[in-house]
């Protein structure tokens, strides 16, 4: 099943002590999915979307960006036929830099 979209969302962090907000969105035909956020291959957080929403926002407390490892990815899972869990491909990576540019 298709990979989700991932994006850093406001309020953007201006230092390593600020919280990080990362939205992960599945295609619209997968509402209510279960989402996993990874950093450097390690699970950071799991969230389930409401039944009529296609995504979630992961709120990472200040200092999370100091954890070792690579960029953030996310993935979602849905129940397919015969209640088998299906996992999406991993999203593209998103990197957090300080400060995040505002346009």
């Amino acid at each position: 099943i298709p990979a989700p979209s991932i994006r850093l969302v406001p309020p953007y962090p201006s230092s390593q002590e600020d919280p990080i907000h990362i939205a992960c969105m599945a295609p619209g035909n997968f509402p209510g999915a279960n989402f996993t956020l990874y950093r450097g291959g390690q699970v950071v957080q799991l969230l389930q979307a409401p039944t009529d929403q296609r995504g979630v926002t992961f709120n990472l407390s200040g200092g999370s960006s100091k954890a070792p490892g690579g960029p953030f990815h996310c993935q979602y899972g849905v129940l397919g036929e015969l209640n088998q869990s299906q996992l999406s491909d991993l999203s593209e990576p998103v990197n957090v830099s300080f400060p995040v540019p505002t346009w």
Partner: antibody
């Protein structure tokens, strides 16, 4: 079928105020951010404002900031746009638009209403 | 603000033809791009979101591609009901911005 119906448009004199309403049906209104988008005659579509699902976050286009206020009443499944100090440049069809299955602006847009026409003229 | 441009601004074509519309953003918007179809007096209709995802209920003859700054909408075999104006729109940053539109007319 998901539906958005805008009302409140009409002919209004410059400097006056007007309130547009948008009634939503067949979806859980309180779970979705909502937008207003407008299109002036012969012009491009212009995003006007957005409000998050719980009403806590509102954002506006520069052209309307300070004059327009977006609000919502989730108990009535209704979105509003209060427009003050109207000028001829505000003449347009105003569309109510649902966020694409999400509570904030960054989910994009999916379902649109048919629009209501606002004409500002003396 | 992010500027969106579209080409062509209009085109005349026939039923059964393949049509390609391009959209370009003034800076990278990743894949946060949607395509809408609009007919006069009607509500605009979402066709494609996230650059390439087909909206539920939209015929498979519509497809989207691209990322960064360059995007394409393709209609593989034009049907009579496809004659309309098509708009691209970015949702990476506020304010959301739209392309000027491409009007697809019957030859």
């Amino acid at each position: 079928e998901v539906q958005l119906v805008e009302t409140g448009g009409g002919l209004i004199q410059p400097g006056r105020s007007l309130r547009l309403s948008c009634v939503a049906s067949d979806f859980r209104f309180s779970n979705h951010a909502m937008h207003w988008v407008r299109q002036a005659p012969g012009k491009e579509l212009e995003w006007v404002a957005v409000i998050s699902s719980d009403g806590s976050n509102r954002q506006y286009a520069y052209s309307v900031k300070g004059r327009f206020t977006i609000s919502r009443d989730n108990s009535k499944n209704t979105l509003y746009l209060e427009m003050n100090i109207l000028g001829p440049e505000d003449t347009a069809v105003y569309f109510c638009v649902r966020s694409h299955l999400g509570p904030e602006w960054y989910y994009g847009m999916d379902v649109w209403g048919q629009g209501t026409t606002v004409t500002v003229s003396s | 603000d992010i500027q969106m441009t579209q080409s062509p601004s209009s085109l005349s074509t026939s039923v059964g033809d393949s049509v390609t519309i391009t959209c370009r953003s003034s800076q990278s918007i990743s894949t946060f791009l949607s395509w809408f179809q609009h007919k006069p007096g009607k509500a605009p209709n979402l066709l494609i979101y996230d650059a390439s995802s087909l909206q539920s209920g939209v015929p498979s003859r519509f497809s989207g591609s691209g990322s960064g700054t360059d995007f394409t909408l393709t209609i593989s075999s034009l049907q009579p009901e496809d004659f309309a104006t098509y708009y691209c729109q970015q949702s990476d940053y506020l304010p959301f911005t739209f392309g000027p539109g491409t009007k697809v007319e019957i030859k």
